[in-house]
Amino acid sequence: SWMWNQFFLLEEYTGSDYQYVGKLHSDQDRGDGSLKYILSGDGAGDLFIINENTGDIQATKRLDREEKPVYILRAQAINRRTGRPVEPESEFIIKIHDINDNEPIFTKEVYTATVPEMSDVGTFVVQVTATDADDPTYGNSAKVVYSILQGQPYFSVESETGIIKTALLNMDRENREQYQVVIQAKDMGGQMGGLSGTTTVNITLTDVNDNPPRFPQSTYQFKTPESSPPGTPIGRIKASDADVGENAEIEYSITDGEGLDMFDVITDQETQEGIITVKKLLDFEKKKVYTLKVEASNPYVEPRFLYLGPFKDSATVRIVVEDVDEPPVFSKLAYILQIREDAQINTTIGSVTAQDPDAARNPVKYSVDRHTDMDRIFNIDSGNGSIFTSKLLDRETLLWHNITVIATEINNPKQSSRVPLYIKVLDVNDNAPEFAEFYETFVCEKAKADQLIQTLHAVDKDDPYSGHQFSFSLAPEAASGSNFTIQDNKDNTAGILTRKNGYNRHEMSTYLLPVVISDNDYPVQSSTGTVTVRVCACDHHGNMQSCHAEALIHPTGLSTGA
C-alpha cells in the first residue's frame, strides 16, 4: 500500500535549488531499484518532477497559491522488470501553503459619496471594501482592517466594515463643500508587517436649508411715473441665500405699508429676484411717495433648523411716484344743457369747467370742436367756459345739438381733453296749428240740415308740455249767413255740418269755408285754412253721382250719411 500524507508546499519559494515537496513510497519497495515511480496529473513533469527510483518529488518553479492553491496528481509504482503495477494508481493532493504576499485591494480606486451638511455625528456616508487575495482560512494574511489616513477630524471609518461616517458636528457646506478622504486597508489584522492598500473617497456635502434669505440692504428706493399701467415692473430687489437649488428659492411678499394695495411683488422664476410691480393706477396728485415692507422667505423650510431663527428677512421699499403732465380734467364726463328756441344771439346756455390735475395747475382755454358744430351755432368763452348762442335756434329743425368742447393747457397745447355737450332746445309756441291735410269734400243736393260732411284734423310743429289743445271756428267774415257750421269736438278735431235742408248746385256749385285753427299755448298761434265743399247730385243712399264740371280731388269715403 501507499505510504504518504497530504503534501504541503510553501508558495513563492525563492531558494536556488528545486523545492522539495515530499516522497512517494510503497511498502512493496525493497530499496533494490526494482520499482519505478511515475507521476501524472496537474503540472507533472513540468512543475513537479519525481525521482523514479526514490519517489522524491520536487517543485521546479515558484508557485503562487493565489493562482492555484491545490494541485491534484496521480502516483503509480510499477515493477521495472514486468512493467506491472505493484500498487493501484492513486490520486494525491499537493496543497500550496499561503504566505502573506498580497496587499488588500479596494473595489474602486476612487469612491464618490455625498452626505447632507449639518448631519449628526455618526451619519453613514459610504462603505468601502478591500479584498485580499491571500488565504482567509489560514492565519491573518487576509484579515483586513480599515483606518483613515486623511480626512480627520471630519470623517471616521469603522475598522472592520469599512463604513465611513461623519465625525464632526455641524459640517457646513457653505464653509466647505468638498472633502478628500484617504482610507487604508491593512491585512494581518492591522498588525506590524501587514500589507496595505489605499483608496480615495471624494465626499461632497449636499445642501440643506440651514440659511435664511438675507437682504443685502435694509432700504430700497424706486421711481415710477404716475402713468404706469397695472402690471408695470418698477424695480428689482434680491435677497441672497447661501443655500443652493430648492433651498435657495425665495418667495417675496408685501407685508405692510401704505402701498399694500397699490403694488405687488413677484419672484423672477429664474433669477430669484423680487420684482415690484404696479397693482393699481397711481395718482401723483393724490400720493407722491409709498413705503412698503417686503419680506423674503424660503418656501421650503426644514423644521430642525428653525432654532437658528426665522427663515425670512424684511426690507423697506420706498416708491416715489413721478408727476406726468396730464391733460385737463372736466368736472363732468358729459354736460347736458338746455335753452329756449327763442333765445337771442349771445344768450348764455351754461358753462363747462376743466382743471389741470397736475400740481402746476396750468391755466386752460376752452374751444368748440368745429367738426361737431359746422354751422357755428354755438360759441364758448375761451377763458371761463361759458357756452352761448351765435345763431338763432329752431327746435322744430333740430331738437338736440351734440357738440364737443376742448380744454387745452395754455402752456402746453399738446395736453388737451374733450367732453361731449348735449344741448336740448326747449319748445316755444312759435308755430300755428294747420290742417293735417288738404280738405275738399261734397254735400248732396238733398242733404238735411246738421248733417256731418267732413271731420277736420290739425297738426302743430310745436311740442307743448301739456300736449296740443286746438280750437276750430269759422272765420269771422264767413260766420254770419254761412251755409255750414263748424262743430269743435274738443278733442283736437272738428266737424263741418250742413246748416240748411237742400242745396242747389246750379245756384252754387262750390263753397269755400275759411276755418280758423288756434292753439291754447302762449302766445296763442292761429292760422286759417280753407275747406272746399262741392254740391253734388246723389242717389238715395247718399252716394255721389255727379257734381259740377270739375271732378273732386278726394271723393273717396266721403258721404252725407256720415
Epitope: 397695472p230 415692473p233 413677484i266 419672484t267 423672477d268 422664476q269 429664474e270 420684482i275
Partner: antibody, heavy 121, light 107 residues
Amino acid sequence: EVQLVESGGGLVQPGGSLRLSCAASGFTFTTYAMNWVRQAPGKGLEWVARIRIKNNNYATYYADSVTDRFTISRDDSKNSLYLQMNSLKTEDTAVYYCVRPDYGNYGLAYWGQGTLVTVSS
Amino acid sequence: DIQLTQSPSSLSASVGDRVTITCSASSSISSHYLHWYQQKPGKSPKLLIYRSFYLASGVPLRFSGSGSGTDFTLTISSLQPEDFATYYCQQDIVPLTFGQGTKLEIK
C-alpha cells in the same frame, strides 16, 4: 425691441433629424428661460421644451411627446437657442415658435414668426 | 400635468357684444401662472393678459381677465371687428400647457 428669428425648418423624412435655431436680440438673453412651442396645421398650441438660465444649471424640460427625441440647448455667447430633433415622426409636422417669457419669466410674451417643419415620406 | 379646458370651443358674436371665455384648470394654480393669448390666422400668438389680470402692452381696455384657483375668465366688454380670432389660456407650471382654444367668429 425684442426680436426672435427662427430658422432651420424644412421637409424631412420620418426617422430623420433637423436642427432649429433661434437668434435673439433686443434683450438680455442670459436672464430668461427660453421655450419652443409648436402648432400643427389647423390645431392648437403645444409647448415642446424649456431651458433655464446658467444660474439654474441650464436645466431642461420637455413635453412627454418629444422626450428622448428632442434636445433643447442654448449658447449665451451667441444669444441663440436651438432644438435638435431626432427620430422625427409625421405628427411632429408643425410650425415651431421660439418664445421668450415676460419679465419675471412668467407667460410667453415674445414669439418669433415661426418655422415650418414638415415630416413626410 | 395640469390640464386646461376652455369653454366654449367656438363662439359667434356681433360687434358690440360682451363676450366671456372661461378656462378651467385640473388643479389649483396661482393667478401669477395663468395667461391669455390671441391668435389670428397665419400669425404668431400674441400675449393679451398676463398673470390673470394684467393687460399686455398695447392691449385695449375692453379686454379684462379675472379668476383664481381653478377658474379663470377672459372678458371682452364690447367686441370690435379686429377681435375676431382664436383665444388660448396657458399655465406656467412645467410641463407648460395650453387650453384647446376658443374660436371667436362673426355672427
